[in-house]
């Protein structure tokens, strides 16, 4: 494995990021900030790329299947969380198929830096971003019900995953901004019924003296629908995002409101609080078999079933979140560490003091993970990430649970020959799971002066496709040294987040 020039592999990095985004089933598109490191290895007629990519979440859902650079800037009237990440990626290309870049595996860590960047000085509002988004499922359900009243074609959609929740508080009232995915759950499952997904943005406004979230005085919701088989927006109507800082009451209200939680509602105080399904296994104990690399684009839409799929978390990126508000004490709708107060003025990403143990103010003063410059989380896994589940677009998610006669394996995705699946801690052998390639781990929000812990690099071995010795693993351990001509330059427009990335890697 030899170091290579970061700028020389830019086309591969950009394409790899597009493939990663297209593999993901929840969250927001990653946009490339810079190539932090690059190595390559040549095996016969195949080039293996080992890339480290610094990324930032956009405001476009991965369900949109857009190319990462085609995501428009968000509506500036709506608070937008700043989430950065770093991905270690292994990709391959055959010399005779120059367009055929394949992503073999990837590990990403992500973290919100909104609180750390927030500046609330003289701000008339406090903005909090909640890590514990599940708390607001009820609001999402109410908003979707309202949307259904006005859009008959949405009658069979259900809320899938609550992706982001922001709160804006001030003297004029309180607004909750809830982003969530939905999926079509038709009553009758026809064998080839397309599994349609959507993404909704709901803005709920509450009177300044409201005591609960049940009856917003104003509710605005807009949804887009995506057909995974076409990878296109099938309703063609750009979402209209409402006016987040307008407290008027023209719209019918139908949503709830969370009380004030300390700003730091990101759950930071419980940095290792397990997700509802229990803590994820460590990244190096993935319970997935490794199927062959998928061709570019989303994986085939095979009927996948997996016992953990009933909870709407489809996708590899489910991260267990911690709310990190930055703001005020009220942010606590999620038990966050309300600590630090990170007031963040009106800046769209500002957070206020998270009164919730959030980090925003990390009121508790210490970053839950410290810096871990070597990329290993002290606990051996990223406590906030959800282990990648075997979810695909055909998951059941919020719809009916899979029939009992279906096992835990994907049809058609056994482990590669000779590869036994690694078992999770304390578990005996189980049937092979389908392996959704790649993982994204969400860490608690970063505070000023902290850097994003590096993702794990302990990828399982894989045989190269079309290789003479398919049983022989061909990938080398992920390089730990940094290429001399790296990192590359940050793309313009993202200078404020550069401080959260390590500039050198452990030797």
């Amino acid at each position: 494995v030899s170091p290579t020039d970061c700028s020389a592999v830019e086309p591969e990095a950009e394409k790899a990021l597009d493939l990663i985004n297209k593999r993901r089933r929840d969250g927001y598109l990653f946009q490339l900030l810079r190539i932090a490191d690059a190595h390559l290895d040549r095996v016969e007629n195949t080039t293996v790329y080992y890339l480290v990519l610094d990324v930032q979440e956009s405001d476009c859902s991965v369900l949109s299947r857009k190319y990462w650079n085609d995501c428009e800037p968000p509506d500036s009237r709506r608070p937008s969380e700043i989430v950065i990440g770093q991905c270690k990626v292994i990709a391959t290309r055959h010399s005779h198929e120059s367009q055929d870049l394949r992503v073999i595996d990837f590990n990403c860590t992500t973290s919100s830096v909104s609180s750390a960047l927030a500046n609330t000085k003289d701000s008339p509002v406090l903005i909090d971003f909640f890590e514990d988004t599940e708390r607001y499922r009820k609001q999402a359900n109410k908003a979707l019900e309202k949307y259904k009243e006005e859009n008959d074609d949405f009658a069979s959609f259900r809320v899938d995953r609550i992706e982001r929740v922001a709160r804006v508080r001030g003297g004029e009232g309180t607004g909750y901004f809830v982003d969530f995915s939905v999926r079509n759950c038709p009553r009758h499952h026809f064998p080839r019924h397309p599994n349609v997904f959507g993404f909704c943005r709901a803005d709920l406004f509450y009177d300044v003296e409201a005591l609960d979230l049940e009856s917003p005085k104003n509710l605005v919701i807009n949804c887009e629908v995506f057909d995974p088989q076409e990878h296109e927006n099938i309703n063609g109507v750009p979402p209209h995002l409402g006016h987040p800082f307008h407290w008027g009451g023209h719209e019918r209200s139908s949503t709830t409101k969370p009380p004030f939680k300390p700003h730091g509602s990101r759950d930071h105080h419980h940095p290792h609080k397990p997700h509802e399904h229990g803590p994820p296994p460590p990244p190096d104990e993935r319970d997935h078999s490794h199927g062959p690399p998928l061709p570019q684009g989303p994986p085939p839409l095979l009927p996948m079933s997996c016992s953990s799929c009933q909870h709407a978390t489809f996708g590899t990126n489910g991260a267990q979140r911690h709310s990190h508000n930055n703001n005020s004490s009220d942010l606590h709708p999620h038990k966050h560490h309300s600590h630090e107060q990170h007031p963040h003025g009106h800046h769209p990403h500002a957070h206020h003091p998270h009164e919730h143990d959030t980090h925003r103010q990390h009121p508790h003063g210490h970053h839950p993970h410290g810096h871990h410059p070597h990329g290993h989380h002290p606990h051996g896994h990223h406590p906030h990430g959800h282990h990648p589940h075997c979810h695909d677009f055909q998951d059941y998610g919020p719809c009916d649970p899979p029939p009992h006669n279906q096992g835990h394996c994907c049809h058609g995705h056994g482990p590669p020959p000779g590869h036994l699946r690694r078992r999770g801690p304390g578990k005996g052998p189980r049937p092979f799971h389908c392996r959704q390639i790649g993982s994204v781990y969400r860490l608690p929000p970063l505070r000023k002066g902290e850097v994003l812990p590096l993702p794990e690099a302990n990828f399982p071995s894989f045989p190269l496709p079309h290789h003479k010795h398919p049983l022989k693993p061909d990938n080398q351990p992920f390089p730990q040294s940094v290429s001399e001509s790296c990192p590359g330059k940050f793309k313009s427009g993202f200078p404020q987040v550069s401080m959260f990335f390590t500039h050198t890697f452990p030797k």
Epitope: S328, S329, Q341, H342, H352
Partner: antibody, heavy 120, light 107 residues
Framework: QVILKESGPGILQPSQTLSLTCSFS??????????VSWIRQPSGKGLEWLAH???????HYNPSLKSRLTISKDTSRNQVFLRITSVDTADTATYYC????????????WGQGTLVTVSA | DVQMNQSHKFMSTSVGDRVSITCKAS??????VAWYQQKPGQSPKILIY???IRHTGVPDRFTGSGSGTDYTLTISSVQAEDLTLYYC?????????FGGGTKLEIK
């Protein structure tokens, strides 16, 4: 109409555990967004926030007392509880429960308070 | 923790006077400040929140102002029933903290 009412033991001895109950009406802790705090006031002194519990059981504590405090709720009975372990005379105070708002932890509704005296 | 300092424990005034009670936060609390009035033997009563928003039912002689770290409660024309204790509170971040109180007395 929102009403909150605190009750407690009145008098207890140092090292004992203080158990307080806030009974309320006019709102429900099963309603999303609702949260109740405990605040105390030693006689002739200022107010000190102790703990807060939200509808979804999210809890926040004053770090200076966190190791001794436990807040909990019984949603069906419309009650919030506070336990303070290992009390001493400095814990003598009037204890209030108060309802916060969605927009922030400022408190428009308070109980009338219950006086707790810690005395040997 | 954010400390809230009410530098005057007592302030003397006369009925009909205009009086201003001040509160200083140890850091910028972005207008997340409330004011309470407490009469002897009673629980505190909210007057102002978000620095300047008067709570429902509070007489309009009470006004709040301020930003950053400095906040003021002003009573434009003091009435006899206003001669009591006033507290500020920051609702910016936990732990939510109160000032030490200012007692308004008759001159």
């Amino acid at each position: 109409q929102v009403i909150l009412k605190e009750s407690g033991p009145g008098i207890l001895q140092p090292s004992q555990t203080l158990s307080l109950t806030c009974s309320f009406s006019g709102f429900s802790l099963s309603t999303s967004g609702v949260g109740v705090s405990w605040i105390r006031q030693p006689s002739g002194k200022g107010l000190e926030w102790l703990a807060h519990i939200y509808w979804d059981d999210d809890k926040h504590y004053n770090p200076s007392l966190k190791s001794r405090l436990t807040i909990s709720k019984d949603t069906s009975r419309n009650q919030v509880f506070l336990r303070i372990t290992s009390v001493d005379t400095a814990d003598t105070a009037t204890y209030y429960c108060a309802l916060g708002t969605v927009g922030g932890p400022w408190f428009p509704y308070w109980g009338q308070g219950t006086l707790v005296t810690v005395s040997a | 923790d954010v400390q809230m300092n009410q530098s005057h424990k007592f302030m003397s005034t006369s009925v009909g006077d205009r009086v201003s009670i001040t509160c200083k936060a140890s850091q910028d609390v972005s207008t997340a400040v409330a004011w309470y009035q407490q009469k002897p033997g009673q629980s505190p009563k909210i007057l102002i929140y978000w620095a300047s928003i008067r709570h429902t039912g509070v007489p309009d002689r009470f006004t709040g102002s301020g930003s950053g770290t400095d906040y003021t409660l002003t009573i434009s024309s003091v009435q006899a029933e206003d001669l009591t204790l006033y507290y500020c509170q920051q609702h910016y971040s936990t732990p939510w903290t109160f000032g030490g109180g200012t007692k308004l007395e008759i001159k």
